[in-house]
């Protein structure tokens, strides 16, 4: 028997520095977690103790903090090289700055293979990107070889900016011939490493003949065997065992997100490359693990540029940006409109001639808007200003919901109106009218939504049985502020871009902004 240790991360999302327990900015260092310096300590400890170790990343290193905003992926290449990753799969967020924003900072600089079998380049891009990412890679580990085959969510064109010259194929269809190729090269130990979410990971384990282990990402899935060490609730045991269609037991793993855990899986293979046993658990990277001093020193060196960036002007406002709780928790506020407009703008993807865009709607809990921005400071808006408005380090995500769920959400928005509570929704691409004289749960008297399958966008009444795409904060997607109906009834959820980054990009693009209060939210006469 031959034993392999797989160390894995996924959805790190630019958490290069240690974070608080909820993966936001580290405040009390003695209670902070993760970060590449701490990760390196643990990885090196395992490499010294065990003979056959692979360090893998299942995508979405890009996007999530000011590190990515400033360094645009150069930080990912630099620190992944320093940690000596063995391979990485492309995630959807690796395309956030377009293909060029992937090639220049990451593909050209990585000292490790970057993989995806189901992304096919065409046209002029085919030769430009040739060899910079691969469908698979064979890696020598000790006296054996291990094949790693990559995959990426086929929803990427809707979630990011891969352009028109990359085709995202069905994962299973694309993986099978690559795995077959590895078999003909006498590679009998094969890991599928990819970024399509836990459901797809399980399908790959079930359907792709010859895959021995699946290491996944995208869905931020936390798996654990035994008593979990922090706040995350396990979605299943680690590893999650799937019985393949040809009768094999295939371990599937994922390691939550944000570099909080290091996935640790031990696999035992027989001489024919069959998995005999698999066991392990994610390792919580808490403060009991010291940060490596040399990586930490490097982080501090790179940090300097971030501090300078946060005070630079992104753009100007010529109006007061009202982000006060007195406004945003009671009525339409222009800060809410600005943020929602930025959220929609960030998700413009012309992927189908029938649609002007794939999504037109935004909802945003008023309680998530934490500060106004005064225009009387020469109109200047900085990252620092935006960090006061959106201090929680969340993301603006894409969900699919039925009209009936949206109606419930808007009822919840005003079910206890008047108490300055955070659930009051700010909107974009939606016209809502409330009648507060009616009883809670029956206060939405009009709800019109902007069409997407149209050449001239216009507002139509919400249809209860129709499925709509909506951009919203991850906080709401996870049922925050009492929006349990969103969490329970959502049909699909894809993580998006860092909230501040979305707004800062929009302001930089617009240069001068002047958001108005324009009648998106109304109260029927006599009730307000």
């Amino acid at each position: 028997a031959w034993e392999l240790t797989i160390l894995h991360t996924n959805d790190v999302h630019s958490r290069l520095e240690q974070t608080s327990e909820d993966s936001s900015k580290c405040v009390n260092a003695s209670r902070c977690m993760g970060g590449v310096a701490r990760l390196f300590t643990k990885v090196q400890q395992i490499r010294r103790a065990e003979p056959n170790v692979l360090l893998l990343d299942a995508g979405d290193q890009y996007q999530g903090t000011i590190w990515f905003t400033v360094y645009k992926g150069a930080e990912v290449a630099h620190f992944m090289n320093a940690l000596r990753y063995d391979a990485m799969a492309l995630g959807n967020h690796e395309f956030d700055n377009g293909v060029e924003g992937l090639i220049e900072p990451l593909l050209k600089e990585a000292k490790f293979p970057i993989l995806s079998a189901n992304i096919k380049a065409k046209g002029p891009l085919a030769s430009q990107i040739s060899g910079l990412y691969l469908p698979y890679k064979v890696l020598p580990v000790g006296d054996e070889v291990v094949g790693i085959v990559g995959y990426t969510s086929k929803e990427t064109p809707f979630l990011s900016n891969p352009g028109t010259n990359l085709v995202f194929e069905d994962e299973i269809t694309a993986l099978q011939p690559e795995v077959d190729k590895l078999k003909t090269l006498n590679v009998n130990k094969i890991i599928a490493l990819g970024h399509s979410g836990f459901e797809m990971d399980k399908l790959i384990a079930q359907k792709v003949r010859g895959v021995d282990v699946v290491v996944g990402g995208h869905s931020n899935t936390f798996l654990y065997t035994g008593n979990p060490p922090s706040k995350e609730v396990p979605a299943g045991k680690y590893p999650f065992i799937v019985t393949s269609d040809d009768g094999r037991k295939v371990p599937v793993v994922q390691a939550y997100a944000f570099g909080k855990y290091l996935g640790y899986l031990k696999i035992e293979f027989d001489e024919r490359g069959n998995v005999i046993s698999s066991h392990g658990n994610p390792i919580l990277l808490n403060s009991s693990i010291p940060e490596d001093p040399s990586i930490k020193a490097d982080i501090n060196k790179w940090r300097i540029k971030l501090d300078n960036y946060s005070t630079q002007e992104l753009g100007k406002t010529i109006v007061y940006l009202d982000g006060s709780s007195q406004s945003c928790r009671f009525r339409e506020c222009n800060m809410g409109n600005l943020i929602c407009d930025a959220m929609i703008n960030n998700n413009l993807r012309h992927t189908d001639e029938m649609f002007w865009n794939h999504v037109s709607m935004c909802i945003l809990n008023g309680g998530g808007i934490r500060s106004p921005i005064d225009e009387r400071n020469n109109g200047t808006i900085t990252w620092e200003n935006l960090a006061a408005v959106l201090p929680f380090g969340g993301t603006f995500d894409l969900v699919q919901l039925k009209g009936s769920t949206l109606k419930k959400a808007f009822e919840h928005s005003v079910h206890r109106y008047g108490q300055s509570t955070g659930e009051f929704l700010q909107v974009g691409g939606i016209h809502v009218v409330y009648d507060l004289s009616r009883k809670p749960g029956d206060r939405v008297v009009k709800l019109d939504v902007l069409c997407t399958k149209c050449r001239v966008p216009s507002y139509d009444p919400l249809k209860m049985d129709e499925v709509y795409k909506v951009i919203l904060p991850n906080f709401l997607a996870n049922g925050g502020d009492g929006f349990q109906m969103i969490k329970d009834e959502l049909l699909r959820h894809d993580s998006g871009d860092q909230d501040i980054n979305v707004v800062s990009t929009y302001i930089s693009k617009m240069k001068v902004i002047y958001p108005a209060v324009e009648g998106r939210i109304k109260f029927s006469t006599g009730s307000h």
Partner: antibody, heavy 117, light 106 residues
Framework: QVQLQQPGAELVKPGASVKLSCKAS????????MHWVKQRPGQGLEWIGE????????NYNEKFKSKATLTVDKSSSTAFMQLSSLTSEDSAVYYC??????????WGQGTSVTVSS | DIKMTQSPSSMYASLGERVTITCKAS??????LSWFQQKPGKSPKTLIY???IWVDGVPSRFSGSGSGQDYSLTISSLEYEDMGIYYC????????FGGGTKLEIK
Amino acid sequence: QVQLQQPGAELVKPGASVKLSCKASGYTFTSYWMHWVKQRPGQGLEWIGEINPSIGRTNYNEKFKSKATLTVDKSSSTAFMQLSSLTSEDSAVYYCARRVYGTMDYWGQGTSVTVSS
Amino acid sequence: DIKMTQSPSSMYASLGERVTITCKASQDINSYLSWFQQKPGKSPKTLIYRANIWVDGVPSRFSGSGSGQDYSLTISSLEYEDMGIYYCLQYDELYTFGGGTKLEIK
């Protein structure tokens, strides 16, 4: 297939300059960094520097900073290295090599530079 | 600057023999080490990178190993076309070649 074509030889006078070329084909020139390496007769290999053809960014071996200047012409997929104030110490074979995963994969055939009056 | 010390500087070996060449770095180079083969009058050919990963088309008799500061290239069974000069290269911090090992057939 990937090819890096370099002229066979250059004869130059002491104190003069020479501009060596390396024409890339079989791949997109701007997608990979290009290295330059020196080899004196009967000696080992010495790294001079590297250039990112798409943005012109360079990294140099400290020893060659005032000797070598790396440039590219994207339109002809050609990398250049200018060597200045030549002395007999600069007589060597100079190779270009494509960078992948941080190291070198494909090498040119090398240009032999002879510095002689 | 990282210094690479390669040994031996030259060696003779018989056909079919197992041959090992070593390279020592002046500091930990994180396995960022390549091996090259150069034949007289020819340009170098890349054999191995990242300490142990073969370049496509390189015969399986060549293998690389090592970590930290110490690395080696092994030819499991020497063949006539293997004679030449072998160089290591660290690429952890910029680039430094080893001094070379001249391998000749006995």
